[in-house]
Each structure stands twice: as C-alpha cells, then as structure tokens.
Interface confidence: low
C-alpha cells in the first residue's frame, strides 16, 4: 500500500465567548485539514481525535466517528471543531482576552490530531502536532495556514 | 417556550422557614444561571443570589447571606431558595429569573407571595 | 457595593410623546471587555419586571423599538418615542458588572 499523508492547514476559525461571574473563555476552534489517498483504492476515515493544549494544559478534546471515504488518488479536505475552555488557575487569562487596550489578543496553542483510516481491515494512525496562534478577544476567520505567522504575547507558563 | 413556575403564595410563621421553588421548563436548565430577587410591598427589587445549575455554584449578596440558601435539584429542572428565621421584614415578593453569560434576566417567574404571620 | 441611583421617582407624559428616564452608577459599568453592564427593566402594575434593554444599548427580543438605551459609563438613559398606554409602569435600571448585583429604585412613568 501507498501512503496516506495527513495535513494539518491550520485554524479556520475561533468564536470566542466569556463567563463574566466565573472569568472564563470558551473558545469553539474549527481546525482544516487535508487527507490525501495515495492508493489505488478507496480508504475510511474511521475517526479523528483532536486535542488543544494551552500553557502545557489541555483545554479541550473532541472525537468525530465514520467521517468520509476517500477515493483512489483523491484528497478531502475535513474541517473538525474542537471546543476549549480557559478556566480555573488559567482565568488571569480572562483579563488579557478582554482588555479592549489590546488589538489583537493572540495567545499560543498546540493542535494535536490524530486520523485514523481503514482499508481493507487493516487500520492505520497518523498524528500531527501544531502550534497556532489565535485570538481570544474576538470571533475571528483566519485564510488557511494564517494562524501559524500571527504575533503572540506568550501566556505565563 | 421558556417557562419559570412558581407557587402563588407561602403563609408562614414567625421564626419558621419556607422553601420557595421555581420549575424551569423549554430550556436547558444547567446552561443558564438561576437569580433570585426580592420585592418588599411598594418596594423596589433587590438581587438575592444566584446559582449556577450545571455545577452548584452561588454568590450571594451580603445582605441575603444568613438568611437565603440557594439549591438546584437536576433531576426535576427546579431551583430553590430556603428563608430562614422569618420575620415580617422578609414578607415580599420573591421572584426567580434565569440569565446566561451575556444577557441577564430575560425570563421571570411570576413570584411568589410569601406572609409571615402569626 | 455599586450604587444605582434613579433620582426621579416619577415622570408624567402625554400619550404620543417621548420621555427619558434617567439612572446613574456609583462607579463606571464599562467592562474592560467594551461591554457596559446596565440593563433596564420595565414592571407594568401585578406583573413581573421584564427586561427591556441589555448591555446599556441592546434592544431585548420582543420589544418594541420605540425603547432605546444609551449612556456614558456612569450616567444611562432609557428613552421612549411615541409613548403608550401600555407603557406605565416603574423602570428599574440595574448593574451586573460586578456582585452583588444592585437595581436603582425605580421611575414611575405616568400618564397625563
């Protein structure tokens, strides 16, 4: 079997809402990427797994089952939304996200995903990891691949 | 639609305690706050407290503090308020009203009417 | 605690015309988030309080849009174009910045 290569585009977008009474941010992270079939025949995306880690502290996961099939030496692009909270001993966090001083409140994150694709029965995983910047303060759509060349303020570690 | 269901009217005595209810219904219950708030005869309203039904958490005004205790049973959609030690300073009009993040106090129950006589 | 301060308690006006009802903060509502935590509450006579205005400016669902709300972060008015019957009642502005939350209390609106 040829390969099937997994790649992760970036963040497509971020909606941002705020808990005032409990200093908290949701953020709804919509992630793309591209699956490509290099085979002669056709392969299940069986499921993508997705986490997103802020300050080494994972804020979100999500879970999508029997996505798509992609056929011979085609490419899907797959979008998937991972929702995260920024709270508890994150929530000095909550202050920089409002602060309407501040233009752009990007703040860094790891996007970890995993796809896992059967043909045949025989299962196959590929993972990929990512740092990417995005913005707390507002709802933001990004152009693909945008997000990875942002100007952050570092959160505290 | 969005429904807050409270009992009419509480009679009770002096020194005793009432539980007033307020049945949410036509929303997820766990996703809104719950307020309380009070209304004395030809009086204006005062915020009691709040509850958050997904987790417990409360914040209480000072005032409120020895006298309300605010609860939530999941099970039934219901949100509670215990008074304590009545007197005849806390015959009012007791409402609930829900509120999310952002928009506070769109639904209100219809009150509840609670006495304190002897 | 913030005080809410609605300094007249009634306001007459003639049916057809506009009136302003006025409230004012202890300390400023706007939050660093640009949002300004005032919210207006109509409570026409045996009912309950209904909420008119959120966030100092934003038209709550179902209202008509003869209500508006505007202010600085401290000083907010609630204006009624072409006024109703239906609109008496007592206006409560309140603030939710910070706990506990506290409403002024109260402007009658009467009709002439």
């Known amino acids: 079997p040829r390969s099937i290569d997994v790649k992760y585009i970036g963040v497509k977008s971020a909606y941002v809402s705020y808990d005032v009474q409990k200093r908290t941010i949701y953020l709804n992270i919509t992630n793309t990427l591209n699956i490509t079939n290099n085979n002669y025949y056709s392969v299940e995306v069986e499921n993508i797994t997705a986490q997103v880690q802020f300050a080494k502290t994972v804020i979100g996961k999500a879970r999508l089952n029997n996505i798509t099939h992609i056929g011979p030496l085609d490419m899907k692009q797959i979008d998937y939304t991972v929702p995260t909270v920024i709270a508890e001993e994150m929530s000095y966090m909550y202050d920089f996200c409002t602060l309407i001083s501040i233009k752009v409140h990007n703040i860094v994150l790891m996007m970890q995903v995993t796809v896992t694709t059967t043909y045949f029965g025989h299962s196959e995983q590929i993972s990929q990891e990512r740092y990417q910047y995005v913005d707390c303060g507002r709802n933001t759509t990004y152009q693909l691949g945008q997000s990875e060349y942002l100007n952050v303020l570092q959160p505290q570690q | 639609q969005v429904q807050l269901q409270q009992p009419g009217a509480e009679l009770v005595k002096p020194g005793a305690s009432v539980k007033l209810s307020c049945k949410a219904s036509?929303?997820?219950?766990?996703?809104?706050?719950m307020h309380w708030v009070k209304q004395r005869p030809g009086q204006g309203l005062e915020w009691i407290g709040n509850i958050d039904p997904s987790d417990s958490e409360t914040h209480y005004n000072q005032e409120f503090k020895d006298k309300a205790t605010l609860t939530v049973d999941r099970s039934s959609n219901t949100a509670y308020m215990q008074l304590s030690s009545l007197t005849s300073e806390d015959s009012a009009v007791y409402y609930c009203?829900?509120?999310?993040?952002?928009?506070?106090?769109?639904?209100w129950g219809q009150g509840t009417a609670v006495t304190v006589s002897s | 605690d913030i005080v809410m301060t609605q300094a007249a308690p009634s306001v007459p006006v003639t049916p057809g015309e506009s009136v302003s009802i006025s409230c004012r903060s202890s300390q400023s509502l706007l939050h660093v988030n640009g949002h300004t935590y005032l919210y207006w509450f109509l409570q026409r006579p045996g009912q309950s309080p209904q909420l008119l205005i959120y966030r100092m400016s934003n038209l709550a669902s179902g209202v008509p849009d003869r209500f508006s709300g505007s202010g600085s972060g401290t000083v907010f008015t609630l204006r009624i174009s072409r006024v109703e019957t239906e609109d008496v009642g007592i206006y409560y502005c309140m603030q939710h910045l910070q706990y506990p939350f506290t409403f002024g209390s109260g402007t009658k609106l009467e009709i002439k």
């Open positions: 009203a829900r509120s999310s993040n952002w928009d506070n106090f769109d639904y």
């Open positions: 036509g929303y997820t219950f766990t996703t809104f706050w």
